[in-house]
């Protein structure tokens, strides 16, 4: 059975309360009165005979919920140059700023906007960007595991596998790819054997970024991520 719509203001029955979401109890009037909707504020509080009078928030001010505020809240200041506005300031919502690409949020506001952006750490050669982020949103670096390498200083590049060569000229290590020797055309005619050479990723590789000053990144230990030990007996 649908609840009866009760017009405000009204005196609540003993043991009953006002509807919390869109009403409030005015102690002075001892009545249940209407709250103001998002985008408005209380211009005049209710009394025993007249309900709450609401008015629209002025420019650069907002209310996001049904309220009994005497004034609207001020929108956060404009986004800084290293931020992008992902939600504009309107009468019903605050402005939300997010960090631009290549930066992470070092200080968040309670409303989820970003107060301070920092440049993402870069992972140097031999280290790739881990799939998970640090709790603060910064990049985590992990040592390239066996058979993989990273030869860039980047906040986006992951460790990728060494190319597989038909003829290996120089083995790869954590910071360099394997070098393949040129293949003799006659080799492809050898019967009863199979071999492969250069890799073709079935997904696109992250683009190499221009190296820049590297901040000390967090190091993530993961499967096989102990530093690779160079051994002269293993071909340099």
């Amino acid at each position: 059975v649908p609840a009866q719509v009760v017009l405000t203001p009204y005196k609540p029955e003993p043991g009953y309360e006002c509807q919390i979401s869109q009403e409030y109890y005015d102690r002075k009037a001892q009545m249940c009165c209407a709250k103001c909707p998002p985008g408005q504020y209380v211009k005049h509080f209710c009394n025993k005979t007249s309900d709450t009078v609401c008015a629209d928030c002025e420019a650069s001010m907002y209310t996001q919920v049904w309220n009994q505020f005497r004034t609207c809240l001020s929108c956060s200041s404009s986004c800084t140059t290293d931020q992008v506005e992902i939600r504009a300031c309107t009468k019903q919502q605050n402005r939300v700023c997010a960090c631009e690409a290549g930066r992470y949020c070092a200080l968040k506001t309670h409303s989820g906007s970003c107060r301070q952006c920092m440049r993402l750490s870069k992972c140097g050669p031999g280290f790739g960007v881990a799939s998970s982020r640090a709790p603060n949103g910064n990049v985590l670096c992990k040592a390239c595991a066996p058979g993989t390498f990273s030869d860039t200083t980047s906040s986006t590049d992951v460790c990728r596998p060494h190319r597989i060569c038909s003829i290996l000229a120089i083995p790869g290590n954590a910071s360099t790819d394997a070098v393949c020797a040129p293949e003799s055309p006659t080799l492809s005619a050898i019967p009863r054997t199979l071999y492969v050479s250069q890799p073709e990723p079935t997904r696109s590789q992250p683009l190499d970024q221009e190296p820049g000053p590297s901040q000390t990144p967090s190091i993530l230990t993961s499967l096989g991520s102990t530093p690779i030990i160079e051994q002269s007996t293993k071909g340099g």
Epitope: T148, H162, L168, P171, G172, Y195, E230, K234
Partner: antibody, heavy 127, light 109 residues
Amino acid sequence: QSLEESGGGLVKPEGSLTLTCAVSGFDLNSYYWICWARQAPGKGLEWIACIDGGSTGSAYYASWAKGRLSISKASSTTVTLQMTSLTAADTATYFCARVQSYVGYANYGYPNYFNLWGPGTLVTVSS
Amino acid sequence: IEMTQTPSSVSAAVGGTVTINCQSSEDIDSYLAWYQQKPGQPPKLLIYHASYLTSGVPSRFSGSRSGTEFTLTISDLECDDAATYYCQSAYYSSSADNTFGGGTEVVVK
């Protein structure tokens, strides 16, 4: 470049056999590891063991192969697989395969991507 | 490490798409290879490190990883794709009893 297995044939149960993998077109050096795998008739592939083609002699085995099968580098062009106490379950085509090394490979023993295979040699264990 | 490959057999028409799955019992990172084997021949390495195509392999073949689950997809199926496909854990551990999956026979109609 090629790999060629030899030494297969008919052997009696509890007998022994040594298979040889001969490489040509490249040297067995620290740039490569050589591995053995096998395939029973109509069945899937089963990895056996791998050995460093360089001077370290490092080798490692599937847990079921330890003790009964032994991989070794016989020369700069050959790797052998010695098999003892053979049973009918060892009847299979035995393949040798090449794995590309990288700096520090001996510390881990992986990844094993078999990018060059021999044609295989059939071992039949039967009385 | 146990590699569980499904299905054991799959049939599709020329031009169709086939998906083969491989589940590893342990975390092997992206250390997974896919091989194609035709009767009387040794296996041929198609994909390594879960998603990298080896030279000469058509881009109709692709590999992907989600945790310990790996997938080989063959699109625009051709008659020549009829073969048995194996996944292989390329990660060595002391519990590596069998690094290959059981195989999937692909039949092209």
